[in-house]
Interface confidence: medium
């Protein structure tokens, strides 16, 4: 069952999922000047069986001007830089560490993908929050939100997190302290 709305917004914080429950949809969004191919899938879908989950269907973008360029290749380094790279890389590194039954990892980028990923979460999904760079986390409880079904309606639990000015960004569960680059995540929501 899809969650009716987005996870709660926390001032000066971003959220992301460690892994995505089966049924999660990722919109096939293309960057400006590109569009999804006409015969292409509207979205990618986390699907699978009891032993293995993966993203079904691939997103494909083509130039709005061109008609027949439907190839799908791994983005070149310069193309990847157009994305919010630190955000994506930290998500994918974290996703590589997990293999939860009934969950998918972060999907790899596709050529000419839009800068922001739009996810549609399902009931039971957990997202984790961290303060953006320059803000410190004050925890009163779990810095996470879970989409739950109550009385036939979906709702997200409220994360117990306050982000106050100064110091390093807090880390997501299982994430190593950055060795070389203390950049943290950019100031934008990582998943929607």
């Amino acid at each position: 069952e899809l969650c009716d709305d987005d996870p709660p917004k926390i001032t000066h914080a971003t959220f992301k999922a460690v892994a995505y429950k089966e049924g999660t949809m990722l919109n096939c969004e293309c960057k400006r000047g590109f569009r999804r191919i006409k015969s292409g899938s509207p979205y990618m879908l986390c699907t699978g069986n009891s032993s293995h989950s993966s993203w079904d269907n691939q997103c494909q973008c083509t130039s709005s001007a061109a008609r027949n360029t439907t190839k799908q290749v791994t983005p070149q380094p310069e193309e990847q830089k157009e994305r919010k790279t630190t955000e994506m890389q930290s998500q994918m590194q974290l996703a590589d560490q997990v293999s939860l039954p009934g969950h998918c990892r972060e999907p790899p980028p596709w050529e000419n993908e839009a800068t922001e990923r739009i996810y549609h979460f399902v009931v039971g999904q957990t997202v984790y929050y961290q303060c953006v760079q320059g803000y410190r986390a004050l925890h009163r409880g779990p810095a996470e939100s879970v989409c739950k079904m109550t009385h036939g309606k979906t709702r997200w639990t409220q994360p117990q997190l306050i982000c106050t000015g100064e110091t390093e960004p807090s880390q997501f569960p299982g994430e190593e302290e950055p060795q070389a680059s203390p950049d943290g995540l950019p100031e934008s929501e990582t998943s929607r």
Epitope: L2, D4, D5, D6, G23, T24, M25, N27, E29, C30, R35, R36, K38, S39, G40, S41, P42, L45, T47, I118, H120, V122, R192
Partner: antibody, heavy 118, light 111 residues
Framework: EVQLVQSGAEVKKPGESLKISCKGP????????IAWVRQRPGKGLEWMGI????????RYSPTFEGHVTLSADMSLTTAYLQWSSLRASDTAMYYC???????????WGKGTMVTVSS | QSALTQPASVSGSPGQSITIFCTGT?????????VSWYQQHPGKAPKLMIY???KRPSGVSNRFSGSKSGNTASLTISGLQAEDEADYYC??????????FGGGTQLTVLS
Amino acid sequence: EVQLVQSGAEVKKPGESLKISCKGPEYSFNRYWIAWVRQRPGKGLEWMGIIYPGDSDARYSPTFEGHVTLSADMSLTTAYLQWSSLRASDTAMYYCARLGSYYAFDIWGKGTMVTVSS
Amino acid sequence: QSALTQPASVSGSPGQSITIFCTGTSSDVGGYNYVSWYQQHPGKAPKLMIYDVSKRPSGVSNRFSGSKSGNTASLTISGLQAEDEADYYCSSYTSSSTWVFGGGTQLTVLS
């Protein structure tokens, strides 16, 4: 609870134009695909096409392509189905529906009855 | 793009089980697990009953179940009740990134 609210019934003459609407929720309208489905009196459901309001990408059933146009206005969180020249055979109930997970239509409008008669 | 094939009508007595079949091709039903079933009462909008071949949305009775074999999907309603009397439609995603519905099956619950 997410709802799709459709415009009211219409009575038109053959050759006239028409635009019916389907209003969705403000917070998520531009993130979901909206499909249109026709049901002629006493008949079954026919898939007409689907549109993504986020960028107005539209896909059509071959049966309906060229006869109807799908559009959307994100600022009004509304999807539209329009005809430039109606035929008597367009008389039907028209439903809009949200494309949910697993490629199923999980939320439906109540329908708009279109009657085309001279 | 041909409609999926369903029987025009089926009937059963209260408490019985009935199965509605939906036959397509390898380009729709057989090629994807994206088969869904809808219930429509007279004068009402369709309601999603089964998605992804066999999954039930919350709020749908577990008397409704779905399955698929090859190019044919099926909807089974067990413990038939009077309120199950309605039209039932199958639908599938297709290889051309469109959707197709079945012609519909009228279920009559005999009294």
